[in-house]
């Protein structure tokens, strides 16, 4: 069958999901595409426990997650309900700040250096985290 019982090489298993942590940066949409090409999605944080796991792996570095409000309301890329779900925003965030001078506001969410969330300009080249449920993970990943 197509179901997998373990994570691909270079992915980390945690609570029946597989995670991959980038060490380079991309704009949010390009990071999202990268994950989708891997049959995954940008990480969706559903609990404090998952938050701590991801925070441990990324360290104090701005890192994209699968949360955005580019079409109005905040939405998780996998359809997880935002309003009733886990949140970990920094104080006074999200603020859709327009003062950065790059045009528009801030529509994409990222982990900040302390792990709490901030909204920022989606074009910023931040690191990212891909997530896929274990039974969707590839057995043998593409490697050079």
């Amino acid at each position: 069958g197509s179901e997998r019982t373990c994570c691909p090489v270079n992915w980390v298993e945690h609570e029946r999901s597989c995670y991959w942590f980038s060490r380079s940066g991309k704009a949010w949409a390009d990071a999202d595409n990268y994950c989708r090409l891997e049959d995954a999605h940008l990480v969706v944080v559903t609990s404090w426990e998952e938050q701590k796991f991801v925070q441990h792996h990324i360290g104090p570095v701005n890192t994209w997650m699968g949360l955005h409000d580019q079409n109005g309301p905040w939405k998780w890329v996998d359809g997880t309900d935002y309003e009733t779900g886990f949140k970990n925003w920094r104080p006074e965030q999200p603020d859709d700040w327009y003062g950065h001078g790059l045009g528009g506001g801030e529509d994409c969410a990222h982990f900040t250096d302390d792990g709490r969330w901030n909204d920022d300009v989606c074009q910023r080249p931040y690191r990212w985290v891909c997530e896929t449920e274990l039974d969707k993970a590839s057995q043998e990943p593409p490697l050079l």
Partner: antibody
């Protein structure tokens, strides 16, 4: 040996359809995203479409979106490109290519020999 | 989409020459830059990925450098089998992956 072999090219009239195939061998096909890249006569390379390893996510260049459909059959180790509403500007050699990814960087590391598509009346 | 511009479009060189091809991106692509070699009637061949990483089996006379918007492919000592067309490709915004128009290296 890792290999990709395209087929299905030919001469077709404007507005017509064609289905390209790419048979893969020598690697675990379902583990790799795949792409179609084309090259018009005397021109540079142009990416056309891509599909994730399990086929759940597809991507298209603006020039072909709505006319071309990429798909794959992992049980047959085969990639497809269904081309409808063909135009003269679609005339090109069509290559299938394997996407590899390492540390967040990706590239096309294995290419087929190409199949020629000519759109002309 | 990110536009990739190569220069020169063609160049003439002799065996043993040091050859340099440049590629410029319309916006910063960090190190997301690949180089391909293509001979007439053949498929492209990956030479360098991630700006400077040599693909397995590619001779060490090929090297890549640069970051941001400006990149260079260098062939330190041109060999007879190196006469071909070379193309750069960005993988920062991917998809769509975009390619340069190519640089043809011809016999002088």
């Amino acid at each position: 040996e890792v290999q990709l072999l395209e087929s299905g090219g030919g001469l077709v009239q404007p507005g017509g359809s064609l289905r390209l195939s790419c048979a893969a061998s020598g690697f675990t096909f379902s583990s790799y995203a795949m792409s179609w890249v084309r090259q018009a006569p005397g021109k540079g390379l142009e990416w056309v479409s891509a599909i994730s390893g399990r086929g759940g996510n597809t991507f298209y260049a603006d020039s072909v979106r709505g006319r071309f459909t990429i798909s794959r059959d992992n049980s047959k180790n085969t990639l497809y490109l269904q081309m409808n509403s063909l135009r003269a500007e679609d005339t090109a050699v069509y290559y299938c290519a394997r996407r590899i990814a390492v540390d967040g960087y990706d590239a096309f590391d294995v290419w087929g020999q190409g199949t020629m598509v000519t759109v002309s009346s | 989409d990110i536009q990739m511009t190569q220069s020169p479009s063609s160049l003439s060189a002799s065996v043993g020459d040091r050859v340099t091809i440049t590629c410029r991106a319309s916006q910063s692509i960090s190190s997301y830059l690949n180089w391909f070699q293509q001979k007439p009637g053949k498929a492209p061949k990956l030479l360098i990925y991630a700006e400077s990483s040599l693909q397995s089996g590619v001779p060490s006379r090929f090297s890549g450098s640069g970051s941001g918007t400006d990149f260079t492919l260098t062939i330190s000592s041109l060999q007879p089998e190196d006469f071909a067309t070379y193309s750069c490709q960005q993988s920062y915004s991917s998809p769509p992956w975009t390619f340069g128009q190519g640089t043809k290296v011809e016999f002088k």
